[in-house]
């Protein structure tokens, strides 16, 4: 039950995270005009990855797309790329994880296949979250650099008579949405990887077969020796009277290829 819950929760958290990454990527408020010097401006500027907008005090808002690729800063292009890669990986991860969900039965899919798919989607979510966090962080760093550069030459004018105020930009709402969304996707991915360990099927425990000896009636259970080797799931040396049947989410402690992710 714990594995199903972990997997389900990981899926939901990742879903919310990826929705957030998509929202952040589409948002126009990656950077917003710093109002420290002029809190009562009648014109408010803000910029996104795809367009820049101006909201007038009158309520009129005008947005203009960046209709050039070559004229844009390399950093902005890099941020765009990171966010898109994050979205694509996250979307594929979601698709894979839907089929990997333990609560969904698809034909006669093996538990090992589900475990592999859960691990794959988990890794994709982790990379997706890291891409989003990296993208947002690169943009934030770019903003901080530009902010201090524009502060250094904030006012230019002739003899101090005429002032030309350079517009400074600070963190917009999209950055915080992106950081939170990236974090959620990352957490969701980790949860999927944890759930994968519990999903991996244990080595086949054959049904107990009774052998009737001449004088005694002994039930022989193959695999019982594992108690001493430390590799079997029966490390507590408990008797397997049910012929190897176990509950879905029973924790398995034997090492597998999934333990070293």
């Amino acid at each position: 039950m714990a594995v199903t819950a972990c997997q389900g929760l990981g899926f939901v958290v990742s879903l919310i995270g990826i929705a957030g990454i998509i929202a952040a990527t589409c948002m126009d408020q990656w950077s917003t005009q710093d109002l420290y010097n002029n809190p009562v401006t009648a014109v408010f500027n803000y910029q996104g990855l795809w367009r820049s907008c101006v909201r007038e005090s009158s309520g009129f808002t005008e947005c203009r797309g960046y209709f050039t690729l070559l004229g844009l800063p390399a950093m902005l292009q890099a941020v765009r790329a990171l966010m898109i890669v994050g979205i694509v990986l996250g979307a594929i991860g979601l698709l894979v994880s839907i089929f990997a969900l333990k609560c969904i039965r698809i034909g006669s899919m093996e538990d090992s296949a589900k475990a592999n798919m859960t691990l794959t989607s988990g890794i994709m979510f982790i990379v997706s979250g890291l891409c989003a966090i990296a993208g947002v962080s690169v943009f934030a760093n770019m903003l901080v650099t530009n902010f201090w550069m524009s502060t250094a030459n904030m006012y230019t004018g002739m003899g101090g008579m005429v002032q030309t105020v350079q517009t400074r930009y600070t963190f917009g709402a999209a950055l915080f949405v992106g950081w939170v969304a990236g974090g959620l996707t990352l957490i969701g991915g980790v949860m999927m990887c944890i759930a994968c360990r519990g999903l991996a099927p244990e080595e086949t425990n054959y049904k107990a077969v009774s052998y009737h000896a001449s004088g005694h009636s002994v039930a022989y259970k193959p695999g019982g020796f594992k108690a001493s080797t430390g590799f079997g799931s029966n490390t507590k040396n408990k008797k397997i009277y049910d012929g190897g049947a176990r509950t879905e989410d029973e924790v398995q402690s034997y090492p597998s290829k999934h333990d070293y992710v």
């Epitope: 009648a42 014109v43 500027n45 803000y46 007038e56 009158s58 309520g59 517009t167």
Partner: antibody, heavy 118, light 113 residues
């Protein structure tokens, strides 16, 4: 047809109060920010106050701050200007105006005259 | 506060001539976000409210005759009236639309020679 009609002006004693109204018609009042602008006799235009469409943002000219209060009732399509502690220098024609793109005022009322005198 | 300075304060003209009115601001009215200048021109006839002529320094309001042209950028702006008509002989105000408090120039009065 867009119409703005101011009312409430008149003779007021110094230190007195007055509430001006501006009735709007011919447009969706709740979609627009509104201004009060005044003009002293034989003088130029002086901006008084601004209120956004939903009343979330309000600005005042420094000389009016604390004495004047701008408000609006979108249900009644009416803009208000409550004036207190009036001085002789507040004597002017008060206009209400609609705020549009370019941060410009495209429609103005005919104005209401306020005279502050003892 | 942004100070708006209009010159001349009055101007004597003859019908049909071209007139240039000047307006200077103490601070740039150019918004970097959309490269638009937030300067507005109004016309006010006696005993009438002001009438919007031009916004964004050069965009003519609908219904305004094309003999009215706004130009300029940053801190220096002009309103040009080509082929002045008798009905144009009145007062013109420029207004800072970039920052609160919204400030008006003292006005330029056009008078008949």
């Amino acid at each position: 047809e867009v119409q703005l009609v101011e009312s409430g002006g008149g003779l007021v004693k110094p230190g007195g109060s007055r509430k001006l109204s501006c009735a709007a018609s011919g447009f969706t009042f709740s979609d627009y920010g509104m201004h009060w602008v005044r003009q002293a006799p034989e003088k130029g235009l002086e901006w008084v106050a601004y209120i956004s469409s939903g009343s979330s943002t309000i600005y005042y000219a420094d000389t009016m701050k604390g004495r004047f209060t701008i408000s609006r009732d979108n249900a009644k399509n009416t803009l208000f200007l409550q004036m207190t502690s009036l001085r002789s220098e507040d004597t002017a024609m008060y206009y209400c105006a609609r705020f549009v793109r370019g941060n410009s005022m495209d429609y103005w009322g005919q104005g209401t005259s306020v005279t502050v005198s003892s | 506060d942004i100070v708006m300075t209009q010159s001349p304060s009055s101007l004597t003209v003859t019908a049909g001539e071209k007139v240039t009115l000047s307006c200077k601001s103490s601070q740039s009215l150019l918004n970097s976000g959309n490269q638009k200048n937030y300067l507005t021109w109004y016309q006010q006839k006696p005993r009438q409210p002001p009438k919007l002529l031009i916004y964004w320094a050069s965009t003519r309001e609908s219904g305004v005759p094309d003999r009215f042209t706004g130009s300029g950028s940053g801190t220096d702006f002009t309103l040009t009236i080509s082929n002045v008509q008798a009905e144009d002989l009145t007062v013109y105000y420029c207004q800072n639309a970039y920052s609160y408090p919204l400030t008006f120039g003292a006005g330029t009065k056009l008078e008949l020679k």
